[in-house]
Interface confidence: low
């Protein structure tokens, strides 16, 4: 067992708050001290006339767990004219994703409406706020002239984000074009230099982004997951989506290339609403130095021996033998109703056997639905199917299920004693928990 | 050939019957004076042969009572098994369907009210009488209700516009009564009148995206029995209308709706009061819910959507699915004929596990065919009996906790067959 | 943040029947259990009973079975604890309390004397 | 029920002083699921409501002086107080919430 959970350190956020919801590690070059960011996006903040407007808090990795909300945008809602809003901020979801890349943290609110400049409106095209140490710029790329559901009105741009080894940022919004979704990238170093607060639709030259096809293809949600990994073998990394709708609602997960969103690879579900492409992750688990794909489907139904179907949640492990070449196995839950794969998180070399190691989590699993984590060691054959560990959420809740295991991030060495450490997400008792590995 | 029974120096019982099925030990402590503790180990009929006293001898046994003096049941029998195994052993008993000549029938109309629909609701109003006609070929004392449905009433499903909140039917030109999750609004009667009152006062509703919140109402119309005015003795039908796919559980993530579906019933004043709350139920949690509440679903499906819903058919349980015509012309042909489908099938499901033991079990159905218990019989009539051959296997005796019993249900019907599990582990 | 207000002290004969009142603010009422507990002059603390706020369902430690009740009035975020047919050896101050690690919290405690 | 059994009753000490008292409770308070031992400490000053100092055995609950340590697993629990102060002077009450709630009958720091 790697992961201490004798002693975790648990953080706790404004009660209700989703406190939780996403979480990711953040390690500024201008400190020696690392940080957790744990998205909050019901929290209530200081801006004037928002409520539960959401936010991003630091939290400091060091005994005394203090959490600290980042300032990302202090402002209210900014007027079109006298007595009609441009945007609408309350309950617009900021801190439900939320990723850093050395000074960078990029944190999105997919709920956040807008009146559009056209006509007078409320669409969820979503924002985002990119902050690089000192400087902090909005980043909202459905924020466009491409109105109304059949452009990107409905896009909630930032419903899932990541960044790129080569700073890029890949956001997705499953909304765009009928619910088709879309996603986007864009360089950070062109995101800031082109900021301008009084230009609510900013063009972005070196823009890579998926377009509208045809009917057949609305409501599939591309954008409702996203990860990065090189699947061409150029070095630059790709883009991973999962589309859970896609396929007549069998999900599929689409790889785009990341120099030109040209399509690289498809994956497709086997059972329908199963929802195939919930999460995905991007890691060598099987050390050939290809990328290898993981997939959740939270609600596959497996059938049991007596013919019955009991949902017990799947992940799709796609090893990729040769550039573009995947061999898949699939690794099924072990409790009804518990969503196994609902997260996926590489863990790095946990064990420090050569193999990168991948957590996957069940949050409705184990006693009183509390949550599990699994953690899975990689080995040259591939992914062990039995976990190494089980880690056990501690919180029962009256009103919601603790969801513990719904966000989580590891491959990060917090305590720098030369093991990643994990950090998971239990927004429904509004908390996160950092297991540090030894 | 080889006694495994006799053959190791066993001076314990416990340790003697964990050598195998055929093993024994002998009770009486003095048996084969002067010998060593393993004489007293042996098969069974080698300890009566070298005569230890068959009273004497303790052994694994397996038993299977059905009582027949309290049955309640008068479809499926026995209404109540014990099995009697240890492990390695495996019982065997019949369990018996017999359908009703006529059922009593509840069938309530779950319609989509999105404005697509408006054309198909039309055909609504004039289904009452007609319909209560051709169903009294197949059924007894018949009864209908209604439900409207459209989705979850937040963004990014409807719009949240002041102007168009509460009615977001502009583009389609109709006047609108504001988009709502699920709501009741006919207890099941007899009264065909009231019926066609009822839904002759629905109004269209609209959103904006194109699947709906079907499983949302599906749900609540399966769990609220009070409600609904669900009667035991009746099949009970659940026809869904609908012209566009319905939203997964996880679809609500778009809208910030993150708790999953408590599978509880949660109307006040017959509004569906956690729609905007609560997840929609996975297809799972659906089926779970469905047959539990002995609900038969018939998809009435218009237009290219129609093949979703049959696809989706072999993940819910005891659903059929049909093709509703331009201006739902065939309706009530369609109710009749997915009626009767459903009376000519008998499907059985295993309603909980009992850890260490196997189920296995086989229909027999009235022509001769044996099939898994699952996919059970087709065209059945209502003078037919169908079997089920039920074999119990223990795999081990190692168990903590868990249930003791395990519940065989027919799908559809309103009585299960309880099989007791009774371990035999050790000696007495 | 999270608070409890009891109602205030009371003084009552024994025989009577006595309600004290526990208002909630700061948080989703229905989010924990609301618990009471006994402490009597100069004695130590006596859990006595827990209420889900949710369901409404009741639990009682033994020694408190019988003339104890507690209910809700969930509306204006509030509980209640009642004794009937109240006992000198009543005489103690209550709190109410929601037990959950991070949001602990108790009542200011109400105050009961019986005496004749 | 389980009964909660607290020593010594009371304890005089002077300020600075290293402070143990016991909790015994009677049957094992762990959960061999979640690796929690259900027992919390509360300090309760006169005239004051309790407040809780550690949860779970040993968790010292946000806000708590690092001075206040739990230790202990199973049916026996340890508070330390390791440099006594004169605000720590109240009586500490144990409590496990393994099966409904129990309380300890308490143990009282006084000034020597």
């Known amino acids: 067992f790697n992961l201490d959970v004798e002693s975790p350190a648990e953080y706790a956020g404004p009660e209700g708050s989703y406190f939780g919801f996403a979480v990711d590690f953040f390690e500024p070059s201008t400190s020696s001290r690392m940080f957790l960011l744990v998205g909050a996006p019901k929290a209530n903040t200081t801006q004037p006339g928002i409520v539960e407007g959401g936010q991003v808090l630091k939290c400091e990795c060091s005994s005394s767990r203090r959490c600290q909300p980042i300032e990302f945008d202090s402002t209210g809602n900014r007027d079109y004219a006298k007595d009609d809003p441009l945007e609408f901020k309350s309950h617009q979801w900021f801190g439900a994703s939320v990723r850093s890349k050395q000074d960078k943290i990029l944190a999105c609110a997919p709920l956040y409406h807008w009146r559009t400049e056209m006509k007078q409106e409320r669409e969820p095209v979503g924002t985002c706020f990119l902050q690089d140490g000192t400087k902090t710029v909005e980043y909202a790329p459905c924020r466009s002239k491409n109105i109304d559901a059949d452009g990107q009105g409905f896009c909630q741009g930032g419903f899932s984000i990541d960044f790129t080894k080569a700073d890029r940022v890949l956001l997705g919004g499953p909304g765009s074009f009928y619910w088709q979704g879309q996603l986007i990238s864009d360089q950070v170093a062109e995101i800031i230099s082109k900021y301008d607060p009084n230009v609510y639709s900013i063009k972005y030259n070196n823009q890579l982004a998926t377009r509208t096809a045809q009917a057949i293809f609305d409501d599939s949600y591309l954008g409702y997951s996203v990860a990065v990994g090189d699947f061409n073998g150029d070095g630059i990394e790709d883009f991973v989506s999962g589309v859970p709708r896609a396929a007549r609602t069998l999900g599929m997960v689409y790889i785009y290339d990341g120099k030109n969103m040209s399509s690289l690879h498809n994956f497709t579900g086997e059972q329908m609403a199963a929802y195939f492409g919930f999460s995905v992750a991007a890691t060598d688990i099987n050390g050939d130095d290809y990328a290898d794909v993981f997939i959740g489907a939270p609600l596959f139904m497996d059938r049991g021996s007596d013919g019955k179907l009991q949902e017990v949640g799947q992940v799709s492990v796609s090893l990729q033998r040769a550039v573009g070449d995947f061999q898949t196995t699939k690794l099924n839950g072990f409790e009804v109703f518990a969503r196994f794969g609902s997260a996926i998180a590489p863990l790095g070399d946990l064990d420090q056997d050569g193999f990168n190691d991948i957590a996957i989590a069940a949050p409705y699993g184990g006693e009183d639905k509390k949550g599990l984590v699994y953690i899975f060691n990689g080995r040259s054959t591939g992914l062990n199917s039995v976990p190494s560990q089980i880690l056990e959420g501690q919180w029962a809740a009256q009103s919601m299920p603790p969801s513990f295991g719904y966000s989580m991030k590891g491959a990060t060495d917090v305590d720098r004693n030369g093991y990643p450490d994990l950090v998971v997400g239990a927004f429904g008792v509004d908390r996160a928990v950092l297991y540090r590995a030894r | 050939e080889h006694n495994r029974c006799g053959s190791a120096n066993v001076v314990s019982c416990a340790r003697c019957l964990q050598l195998g099925p055929e093993c024994g030990w002998c009770v009486q402590e003095d048996f084969v004076s002067g010998g060593s503790g393993s004489e007293r180990c042996d098969t069974v009929s080698s300890l009566i042969s070298k005569g230890c006293p068959v009273d004497s001898i303790e052994y694994l046994s397996v038993h299977v009572v059905t009582s027949s003096e309290n049955e309640i049941n008068t479809q499926v029998t026995p209404g109540e098994v014990s099995v009697q195994l240890h492990p390695g052993a495996e019982a065997n008993f019949m369990l018996k369907v017999r359908p009703l000549k006529k059922y009593p029938v509840d069938l309530y109309y779950l319609v989509d009210v999105s404005a697509s629909m408006h054309n198909n609701i039309e055909k609504l109003n004039s289904v009452g009488n007609d319909l209560s006609k051709k169903m009294a070929l197949y059924s007894r004392d018949f009864r209908l209700g209604f439900g409207s449905y459209v989705d979850k009433t937040v963004s990014p499903y409807i719009s949240i516009h002041p102007e168009r909140i509460h009615n977001q039917c502009s583009d389609y030109n109709l006047d609108c009564m504001p988009p709502h999750g699920y709501i009741h609004v006919l207890s099941l009667t007899e009264n065909i009148t009231e019926f066609e009152k009822a839904v002759h006062r629905q109004k269209i509703s609209g959103n904006i995206d194109t699947p709906e919140g079907g499983f949302d109402a599906m749900l609540q119309a399966a769990v609220c029995e009070s409600h609904i005015g669900w009667r035991k003795e009746a099949k009970r039908l659940l026809l869904v209308m609908t012209d566009q796919t319905s939203h997964l559980a996880l679809d609500s993530k778009l809208a910030g709706i993150v708790v999953p579906n408590d599978g509880n019933c949660h109307l006040k004043n017959n509004v569906y009061v956690k729609s905007t709350t609560m997840e929609h139920p996975s297809l799972g949690q659906l089926s779970e819910k469905l047959i539990d509440n002995n609900i038969n679903v018939i998809f009435a499906v218009q237009g290219k959507q129609f093949h979703w819903y049959k696809d989706l058919l072999p993940l819910l349980p005891g659903a059929i699915a049909g093709e509703i015509e331009s201006k739902a012309a065939n309706l009530n042909n369609l109710v009749v004929e997915a009626y009767k489908k459903i009376i000519s099938e008998v499907k059985v499901q295993l309603e909980n596990q009992v850890h260490g033991v196997h189920f296995n079990i086989t229909a027999i159905c009235p022509d001769g065919a044996r099939k898994p218990g699952i996919s059970g019989c087709g065209n059945v009539t209502s003078n037919d009996e169908v079997l089920f051959n039920v074999t119990v296997v223990m795999k081990t005796c190692d168990i903590m906790g868990g249930k003791n019993y395990a519940i065989i249900k027919p799908i559809g019907f309103n009585e299960t067959t309880k099989v007791h599990i009774h371990r035999s582990c050790s000696c007495q | 943040q999270i608070q409890l207000l009891q109602s205030g002290p009371e003084l009552k004969k024994p025989g009577e029947t006595v309600k004290i009142s526990c208002k909630a603010s700061?948080?989703?009422?229905?989010?924990?259990?609301m618990h009471w507990v006994k402490q009597a002059p100069g004695k130590g603390l006596k859990w006595v009973a827990r209420?889900?706020?949710?369901?409404?369902?009741?639990t009682f430690a033994d020694d408190f079975r019988g003339r104890f009740a507690v209910s809700l009035e969930t509306s204006a975020s509030t509980a209640y604890l009642q004794i009937n047919n109240l006992k000198n050896e009543d005489t103690a101050t209550y709190f109410c309390?929601?037990?959950?690690?991070?949001?602990?919290?108790w009542g200011q405690g109400t105050t009961l004397t019986v005496s004749s | 029920d389980i009964v909660m059994t607290q020593s010594p009753s009371s304890l005089a000490v002077s300020a600075g002083e290293k402070v143990t008292m016991s909790c015994k409770s009677s049957?094992?308070?762990?959960?061999?699921?979640?690796?929690?031992?259900?027992l919390a400490w509360y300090q309760q000053k006169p005239g004051q409501s309790p407040r809780l100092l550690i949860y779970?055995?040993?968790t010292r609950e946000s806000g708590v002086p690092d001075r206040f340590t739990g230790s202990g697993s199973g049916t026996d629990f340890t508070l330390t107080i390791s440099s006594v102060q004169a605000e720590d002077l109240a009586v500490y009450y144990c409590?496990?919430?393994?099966?409904?709630?129990?309380f300890g009958a308490g143990t009282k720091l006084e000034l020597k």
């Open positions: 209420i889900n706020t949710e369901t409404g369902e009741p």
């Open positions: 700061g948080y989703t009422f229905t989010d924990y259990s």
């Open positions: 309390a929601i037990f959950y690690y991070g949001r602990d919290s």
């Open positions: 779970w055995a040993s």
């Open positions: 409590k496990q919430s393994y099966n409904l709630l129990s």
């Open positions: 049957q094992s308070l762990l959960n061999s699921r979640t690796r929690k031992n259900y």
